[in-house]
């Protein structure tokens, strides 16, 4: 079974468009637009940083630190209402995403 | 980075038994944590596994006889109510994206009067 | 639920041949295939993951290939090291599900 041009392997995702804002000073807002062709029961998400097929099901419960988003070494916390999550690196630098 | 289980000894039939995983070099929250059996010159089972959120997920044949539970630093494998059919060397292992790329050694479990 | 069958059971080789051991599975696992090497008292250890990606420091002499339902394991240019037994294991839903097991012997 051949892939064709512009057809992703099941379980893989790939970055559409991204954009960034760094308008503001020591903060900078990326919006992105991720394709993935995932297994059945996974939906698109992010897995170490990157878009990646997760586990449809952490969606539903919004438990967004199940999708294992931060890099490996970083803490993984939820927001308030579980409205994204932060990525905490040992530093102290703290990287957040909202999930809209 | 590594990981070693714990518990593994004899146990009379219907002593639950809590093994458990420890891991070194890694943080267990930035992974999904397994549990893999192997009775004696068997192949492989998988019992179940656990999220950074202690959501779990069991193989049909494992539900209510398992119970995988963690800590910061530590993932438990409870075997509720042993039968001989539970001995067998025990396994934990990490995965991101649904293989095992690191594993323990094992601790060997004995189910007998 | 997935079931894997793994063939054959057991096989022997020569060193510096080739060896070729097949995962078949009862349903499309869209490639989201492993192999795994266990040696006696050990516990196993991760040579392919993705139906294709050898794992760093696994020598080149293991390949792996298929699709769908099918999936292969070779051997080429076996060595004397390689007798162990060998596993598939699919991963494109719960329950994660192994193959009986391949023990490669060398002669």
């Known amino acids: 079974q051949f892939l064709k041009e512009g057809q992703l392997a099941a379980g893989t995702c790939e970055i559409v468009t991204l954009d960034r804002d760094s308008s503001q000073p020591r903060r900078t807002i990326a919006r992105q637009t991720v394709k993935c062709s995932c297994f059945p029961g996974q939906i698109a998400g992010t897995t170490r940083a990157r878009p990646a097929c997760v586990d449809a099901r952490i969606i539903k419960t919004k438990q967004w630190c199940d999708m294992l988003p931060c890099l490996e070494g970083e803490g993984c916390d939820l927001l308030i209402n579980r409205s994204g999550w932060t990525c905490t690196q040992p530093g102290g630098r703290i990287k957040t995403t909202t999930v809209s | 980075q590594s990981l070693e289980e714990s518990g593994g000894r004899l146990v009379t039939p219907g002593t639950p038994l809590t093994l458990t995983c420890t891991a070194s070099?890694?943080?267990?929250?930035?992974?999904?944590m397994n549990w893999v059996r192997q009775a004696p010159g068997k192949g492989l089972e998988w019992i179940g596994i656990?999220?950074?959120?202690?959501t779990t997920y069991y193989a049909g044949w494992a539900k209510g006889r398992f119970t995988i539970s963690k800590t910061s630093t530590t993932v438990d494998l409870k075997i509720t109510s042993p039968t001989s059919e539970d001995t067998a060397t025990y396994f934990c292992?990490?995965?991101?994206?649904?293989?095992?790329?690191?594993w323990g050694p094992g601790t060997l479990v004995t189910v007998s009067l | 639920e997935l079931d894997l069958t793994q063939t054959p059971p057991s096989l022997s080789a020569s060193v510096g041949g080739t060896v070729t051991i097949n995962c078949l599975a009862s349903?499309?696992?869209?490639?989201?295939l492993a192999w795994y090497q266990q040696k006696p008292g050990k516990p196993p250890t991760l040579l392919i993951s993705?139906?294709?990606n050898l794992e760093s420091g696994v020598p080149p002499r293991f390949s792996g290939s298929g699709s769908g339902t099918d999936y292969t394991l070779t051997i080429g240019g076996v060595q004397a090291e390689d007798a162990a037994t060998y596993f598939c294991?699919?991963?494109?839903?719960?329950?994660?599900?192994f193959g009986a097991g391949t023990n490669v012997e060398i002669k």
């Open positions: 349903e499309d696992i869209y490639s989201a």
């Open positions: 656990i999220y950074p959120s202690g």
């Open positions: 292992a990490r995965t991101v994206s649904g293989y095992f790329d690191i």
């Open positions: 993705g139906t294709s």
């Open positions: 294991q699919g991963y494109s839903s719960y329950p994660l599900t």
């Open positions: 070099g890694f943080s267990l929250s930035s992974y999904y």
